[in-house]
């Protein structure tokens, strides 16, 4: 889609956005009993030259950015990424109609970076 | 700069991509006395729905890519980001001239993912 | 060996687009991106954008966004640049150039001659 | 934006005398990704000189650059007839490329 951001430059740096997913929206409620949504939260944002601290970036990230200035038509920006992700236990009907809980690992974004 | 992909339907799916930086044309050829470079690669691509296999994505991805598929213009794609970095030795010159062999960690991509 | 090679010359009425292309031969189309420059008279050389014609990748000067679209076809292995509500200011000849990961422009179309009178 | 300045505007010499051409840069260019480019009338500019000092290919060793940071340098020893010509400078360490304004070296 053309839905990228067209100026980078006015884009905020790597960070963590809040979202609430509510199951319903993504058409699970018949199957998930509980909870009814949860904060999942997104990263976005620039992973500009210089990298801060903030930016919890890998050495690898460091070195692609620096590819990136002198090469930007054949090596991206490093992404904003999740760095720390929660899991999440959820009450749900299998496929035979039992209720099961389960943990479900990596659905929360806890903080991001540039990766 | 404007340099987001215009058409990412033309756009591969998220993946490695080779990629070789040699120290001097980072700059940093007077401090890094060996290797001369190495094999950084880099990760590139689309993370659209449906997410395969093969993006080894983690749960928030796949909730990220529906939540972005209803809703374009607030929530992005997950970003291509590696999955996999090892580490590489370098010998280089401390800031009082002694000779020193580090392992840096984080410095190649051997895998990427949808994040 | 290399060869990039321009359509001819325009003549356009202000206000009026153009759609310059360039037909790369003789090395892996998709590889390479490919620059578009151009000069006025009498101007210094001047960056208008480019494109990376493996992934449609694009990027352009501020000075051109909104009126510049860089694009590409890789069956004719050929590039476009088309610039659109032209003015007087942008008579000159607009080149297209490729450079290879870390270096310079290496080779160059031979120019297109872009007039804009009314 | 890195503005690069070239000096002198026009170099009237004889064939076989030698040319030193500047190109001064508003900010220090990194890893000496700098370049120098001759353009003939109604030509397109053929690359000479990348890294600031290494010639490209088939370009004759008559042609040196030299210079880091800011201050670069383009010296042609003997010139040939071939040689008169305008001579670009450029840095490409990233985006926006720039270009100096050329200086114009002709037959005095």
């Known amino acids: 889609s053309a839905s990228d951001y067209n100026s980078s430059e006015l884009k905020t740096a790597c960070r963590k956005h809040e979202l609430y997913v509510s199951f319903q929206d993504l058409g699970w409620q018949d199957w998930i009993i509980a909870p009814k949504g949860y904060a999942a939260n997104y990263c976005d944002g620039e992973c500009s030259f210089p990298l801060n601290a903030h930016m919890n970036a890998t050495n690898h990230a460091i070195v692609q950015t620096l590819v990136h200035l002198m090469n930007p038509e054949y090596v991206p920006k490093p992404c904003c990424a999740p760095t720390k992700l929660n899991a999440i236990s959820v009450l749900y009907f299998d496929d035979n109609s039992n209720v099961i809980l389960k943990k479900y690992r990596n659905m929360v974004v806890r903080a991001c970076g540039c990766h | 700069s404007a340099s987001d992909y215009n058409s990412s339907e033309l756009k591969t799916a998220c993946r490695k991509h080779e990629l070789y930086v040699s120290f001097q044309d980072l700059g940093w050829q007077d401090w890094i006395i060996a290797p001369k470079g190495y094999a950084a690669n880099y990760c590139d691509g689309e993370c659209s729905f449906p997410l395969n296999a093969h993006m080894n994505a983690t749960n928030h991805a796949i909730v990220q890519t529906l939540v972005h598929l209803m809703n374009p213009e607030y929530v992005p794609k997950p970003c291509c980001a590696p999955t996999k970095l090892n580490a590489i030795s370098v010998l280089y010159f401390d800031d009082n001239s002694n000779v020193i062999l580090k392992k840096y960690r984080n410095m190649v991509v051997r895998a990427c993912g949808c994040h | 060996q290399v060869h990039l090679v321009q359509s001819g010359a325009e003549v356009k009425n202000p206000g009026a687009s153009v759609k310059v292309s360039c037909k790369a031969s003789?090395?892996?189309?998709?590889?390479?991106?490919i620059h578009w420059l151009r000069q006025a008279p009498g101007q210094r050389l001047e960056w208008m954008g480019w494109i990376n014609p493996g992934n449609v990748k694009t990027d352009y000067s501020q000075k051109f966004q909104g009126r510049v679209t860089i694009s590409r076809d890789t069956s004719a292995t050929t590039a476009y640049m088309e610039l659109s509500s032209l003015r007087s200011e942008d008579t000159a000849v607009y080149y297209c150039a490729r450079r290879q990961l870390w270096l310079p422009f290496d080779y160059w179309g031979q120019g297109t001659l872009v007039t804009v009178s009314s | 934006e890195i503005v690069l300045t070239q000096s002198p505007g026009t170099l009237s010499l004889s064939p076989g005398e030698g040319a030193t051409l500047s190109c001064r840069a508003s900010q220090s260019i990194s890893n000496n990704f700098l370049a120098w480019y001759q353009q003939k009338p109604g030509q397109a500019p053929r690359l000479l000189i990348f890294g600031a000092s290494s010639r490209a290919t088939a370009i004759p060793d008559r042609f040196v650059g030299s210079g880091s940071g800011t201050d670069f340098t383009l010296t042609i020893t003997g010139l040939e007839p071939e040689d008169f010509a305008v001579y670009h400078c450029q840095h490409y360490g990233g985006s926006p490329w720039t270009f100096g304004q050329g200086t114009k070296v002709e037959i005095k």
């Open positions: 003789g090395y892996t189309f998709t590889t390479f991106a």
